[in-house]
């Protein structure tokens, strides 16, 4: 049951369900927008973002964007609605509990992005090939 004062005052678009009909609750994500980063040539990195924020909408997931150009490396951490593109890319891995970086084609820079749907999951960003979800056995591990 939904608590009565939530039931009467929460607009219906707050009651969001996933594909299995389970109710989705507002998520906690690291949310530092764009910060300079020292994360480079590592299998995984911590975001070093000290801000954990509650996402505005229950459907929003955590996102991390890692960018490297000739001058610097940045890491962006935000909440975002997976129905909407981010940096012109679809969040195809939004249901993953882990933030597994995938490279995207962007001219003039190296660009990786990941999204995930467990609390603060964009605090630990994973570049390692061993998490590549094209391996069906790993899908079982990641989504358990």
């Amino acid at each position: 049951t939904i608590p009565p004062h939530v039931q009467k005052s929460v607009n219906n678009d707050m009651i969001v369900t996933d594909n299995n009909g389970a109710v989705k609750f507002p998520q906690l994500c690291k949310f530092c927008d764009v910060r300079f980063s020292t994360c480079d040539n590592q299998k995984s990195c911590m975001s070093n973002c000290s801000i954990t924020s509650i996402c505005e909408k229950p459907q929003e997931v955590c996102v991390a964007v890692w960018r490297k150009n000739d001058e610097n490396i940045t890491l962006e951490t935000v909440c975002h609605d997976p129905k909407l593109p981010y940096h012109d890319f679809i969040l195809e891995d939004a249901a993953s509990p882990k933030c597994i970086m995938k490279e995207k084609k962007k001219p003039g820079e190296t660009f990786f992005m990941c999204s995930c749907s467990s609390d603060e999951c964009n605090d630990n960003i994973i570049f390692s090939e061993e998490y590549n979800t094209s391996n069906p056995d790993l899908l079982l591990v990641i989504f358990q």
């Epitope: 608590p3 939530v6 609750f25 507002p26 949310f31 801000i51 954990t52 229950p58």
Partner: antibody, heavy 121, light 107 residues
Framework: QLQVQESGPGLVKPSETLSLTCTVS??????????WGWIRQPPGKGLEWIGS???????YYNPSLKSRATISIDTSKNQFSLKLSSVTAADTAVYYC?????????????WGQGTLVTVSS | EIVLTQSPATLSLSPGERATLSCRAS??????LAWYQQKPGQAPRLLIY???NRATGIPARFSGSGSGTDFTLTISSLEPEDFAVYYC?????????FGQGTKVEIK
């Protein structure tokens, strides 16, 4: 009517571990619509969030407690508990267990009556 | 973490008067601010959540307003049972944090 009630020792020695239990009645702790947590209030002072969780979700702790806090759940007894290690006199407080709607995470709509824990040798 | 500053620390008023309590956040908390009432020896009680929504069973004389960094709790006409300490709390950034409280006392 869903209610929460704290229980545990009122006196703990410095450097030891404080252990409290919260019993939930009138509803199931496994109902993910509700979040559960602990808040404390030192005598004559304000309120401090210790940590919270909802069933199936991650437990969130206040970083100020530097990993000393552990919240665990026992669905068979409809209880959750708090352990706070390496306590000092600064941990003397009234400890409240609490419930809130997960749809508005962080809001507390039901509190236990509170239990005073004194840290002293 | 976000710091909430409540003012005044103490408010001395008579029954029937209007009480205006302020809560200021060190950075934006959007509309994610709640107000609680605490009487001596009791646990806090939720009054208002998300800046302006009254919790179940809370009388209409309690109202909340504000967004971003500045919030107000108004008690339109004080009843004898309203004399207590009032805390604001944000849930925008975690951990949730509380203000230091405003005591509303009988003048």
């Amino acid at each position: 009517q869903l209610q929460v009630q704290e229980s545990g020792p009122g006196l703990v020695k410095p450097s030891e571990t404080l252990s409290l239990t919260c019993t939930v009645s009138g509803g199931s702790i496994s109902n993910a619509y509700f979040s559960w947590g602990w808040i404390r209030q030192p005598p004559g002072k304000g309120l401090e969030w210790i940590g919270s969780f909802y069933y199936g979700g991650k437990t969130y702790y206040n970083p100020s407690l530097k990993s000393r806090a552990t919240i665990s759940i026992d669905t068979s007894k409809n209880q959750f508990s708090l352990k706070l290690s390496s306590v000092t006199a600064a941990d003397t407080a009234v400890y409240y267990c609490a419930r809130g709607p997960t749809l508005i995470r962080g809001v507390i709509d039901s509190w236990g009556q509170g239990t005073l824990v004194t840290v002293s040798s | 973490e976000i710091v909430l500053t409540q003012s005044p620390a103490t408010l001395s008023l008579s029954p029937g008067e209007r009480a205006t309590l302020s809560c200021r956040a060190s950075q934006s908390v959007r509309s994610y601010l709640a107000w609680y009432q605490q009487k001596p020896g009791q646990a806090p009680r939720l009054l208002i959540y998300d800046a302006s929504n009254r919790a179940t069973g809370i009388p209409a004389r309690f109202s909340g307003s504000g967004s971003g960094t500045d919030f107000t709790l108004t008690i339109s006409s004080l009843e004898p049972e309203d004399f207590a300490v009032y805390y604001c709390q944000q849930r925008s950034n975690w951990p949730p944090t509380f203000g230091q409280g405003t005591k509303v006392e009988i003048k």
